[in-house]
C-alpha cells in the first residue's frame, strides 16, 4: 500500500544520536506518545534496555529502510547488545501502525538466545547504535 | 547554505537513455534529506520522479519505475537520474530538489531537456 | 494515485485583491489529523517556490499575507492582499500518499 508508516517516537535522555531525520514528527493532540510518520520505511523499531527487574525503552521510531523483521505485524523482540554487565538491549523491527509502542514478550534475562553477560560491552550510547 | 544545480545534455534522441546529474553545495548528501527529481513539461505541472534519501535507499513514481534509475556519487556529492527509451512526451523542464520533510524546500534552477531527432 | 484538481485554472486580480485558490484531492491528505498538503509559487523560467507545508505552515521568509488552510480533501491557499510580485502560477502538492502528486496549477493574472 502506498500509504506511509506511523510509529511511535521516543528517545530516552542521554541517548546519542537521534532518528527523528528518519520521519515527520506528528501533532498528535497529546504529549506522549509521540507519533512519527516515517520517510523512508514502511517499519518502525523500538530498543529496550532489559536488567534484573525491569525493561526499559531506550529508543522508538522509523527505521532508515525496509529489512528482514519489517513485515512483522507486531513488536517481538530479540537480544542485540550488552550495555553493561546484567543489562540486555533487545531490539525490534514491525510493519504496522504504532506496532513498536510495546514488545509482545521479552525472554527473561539469562535465558536461552539472550547473550551471555560475559559478551562484549559497549559504552551507553555506542551500544544502541550497535542495537538498531 | 544548500544549492543544487543541474547538468547535463539539453537534446536526447527518442529511444535513447536521458542523464542528469545534480551537485549539491553547502551540504552533503549522506547527512540527511532526500535527493529527488521533479520534471514539468513545457507549460504544464509538475511530476516527482522519485528520490535517493541520505542512506542510499530509494523511491520512484509508479508510472516511471520501469524506466528511471536514481544513483549518487557521495564522493562528488551528486546524483543522478538516468532515463530509458524516451519520447517526446519526456521532453521537460528537470528539476533536482532536497527534502527534509515531504515537501520541497530546495530547488535546482532546472535544465530543459529536448526529445527529438 | 492521489488527484489534485486545483480552482480556478487561472485567474485575473488587482493588486491589493484577496485571492482563494483552492486544491481538492481525490481522497483524504490526512494522517492521525496531520494534513500533508503544501503549496508552492512558480514564476516564469524559475523554479517553485514553497510557501506553505503542511496545510497551514508558513515557510520561513515568506510574507504573512499567504496563509493556507483545509483538511482531509479541501484546501485553501488566500493571499490576503495582492502583491505586484504575486502574479505567478501557484500549485498544491499531497505528500499524504505515494507517489508525492502536484495540482495542475493556477495562474494569478493582473486584470
Known amino acids: 500500500p502506498p500509504n506511509r508508516r506511523t510509529c511511535v517516537f521516543f528517545e530516552a535522555p542521554g541517548v546519542r544520536g537521534s532518528t527523528k531525520t528518519l520521519g515527520e514528527l506528528l501533532d498528535t493532540g497529546t504529549e506522549l506518545p509521540r507519533a512519527i510518520r516515517c520517510l523512508y520505511s514502511r517499519c518502525c523499531f523500538g530498543i529496550w534496555n532489559l536488567t534484573q527487574d525491569r525493561a526499559q525503552v531506550e529508543m522508538q521510531g522509523c527505521r532508515d529502510s525496509d529489512e528482514p523483521g519489517c513485515e512483522s505485524l507486531h513488536c517481538d523482540p530479540s537480544p542485540r547488545a550488552h550495555p553493561s554487565p546484567g543489562s540486555t538491549l533487545f531490539t525490534c523491527s514491525c510493519g504496522t501502525d504504532f506496532c513498536n509502542a510495546n514488545y509482545s514478550h521479552l525472554p527473561p534475562p539469562g535465558s536461552p538466545g539472550t547473550p551471555g553477560s560475559q559478551g562484549p560491552q559497549a559504552a551507553p550510547g555506542e551500544s544502541i547504535w550497535m542495537a538498531l | 547554505q544548500l544549492q543544487l544545480q543541474e547538468s547535463g545534455p539539453g537534446l536526447v534522441k527518442p529511444s535513447e537513455t536521458l542523464s542528469l546529474t545534480c551537485t549539491v553545495s553547502?551540504?552533503?548528501?549522506?547527512?540527511?534529506?532526500?535527493w529527488n527529481w521533479i520534471r514539468q513539461p513545457p507549460g504544464k505541472g509538475l511530476e516527482w520522479m522519485g528520490y535517493?534519501?541520505?542512506?542510499?535507499?530509494?523511491s520512484y513514481n509508479p508510472s516511471l519505475k520501469s524506466r528511471v534509475t536514481i544513483s549518487r556519487d557521495t564522493s562528488k556529492n551528486q546524483f543522478s537520474l538516468k532515463l530509458s527509451s524516451v519520447t517526446a512526451a519526456d521532453t521537460a523542464v528537470y528539476y533536482c530538489?532536497?527534502?527534509?520533510?515531504?515537501?520541497?524546500?530546495?530547488w535546482g534552477q532546472g535544465t530543459l531537456v529536448t526529445v527529438s531527432s | 494515485d492521489i488527484q489534485l484538481t486545483q480552482s480556478p485554472s487561472s485567474l485575473s486580480a488587482s493588486v491589493g485583491d484577496r485571492v482563494t485558490i483552492t486544491c481538492r484531492a481525490s481522497?483524504?491528505?490526512?494522517?492521525?489529523?496531520?494534513?500533508?498538503m503544501h503549496w508552492y509559487q512558480q514564476k516564469p523560467g524559475k523554479p517553485p517556490k514553497l510557501l506553505i507545508y503542511?496545510?497551514?505552515n508558513l515557510e520561513s521568509g515568506i510574507p504573512s499575507r499567504f496563509s493556507g488552510s483545509g483538511s482531509g480533501t479541501d484546501f485553501t491557499l488566500t493571499i490576503s492582499s495582492l502583491q505586484p510580485e504575486d502574479f505567478a502560477t501557484y500549485y498544491c502538492?499531497?505528500?499524504?500518499?505515494?507517489?508525492?502528486?502536484f495540482g495542475g496549477g493556477t495562474k494569478v493574472e493582473i486584470k
Open positions: 530538489a532536497g527534502s527534509r520533510y515531504s515537501w520541497f524546500a530546495y
Open positions: 553547502g551540504y552533503s548528501i549522506t547527512s540527511d534529506f532526500a
Open positions: 535517493i534519501s541520505f542512506s542510499g535507499s530509494t
Open positions: 481522497e483524504s491528505v490526512d494522517t492521525y489529523g496531520n494534513s500533508f
Open positions: 503542511r496545510a497551514s
Open positions: 502538492q499531497q505528500s499524504n500518499e505515494d507517489p508525492y502528486t
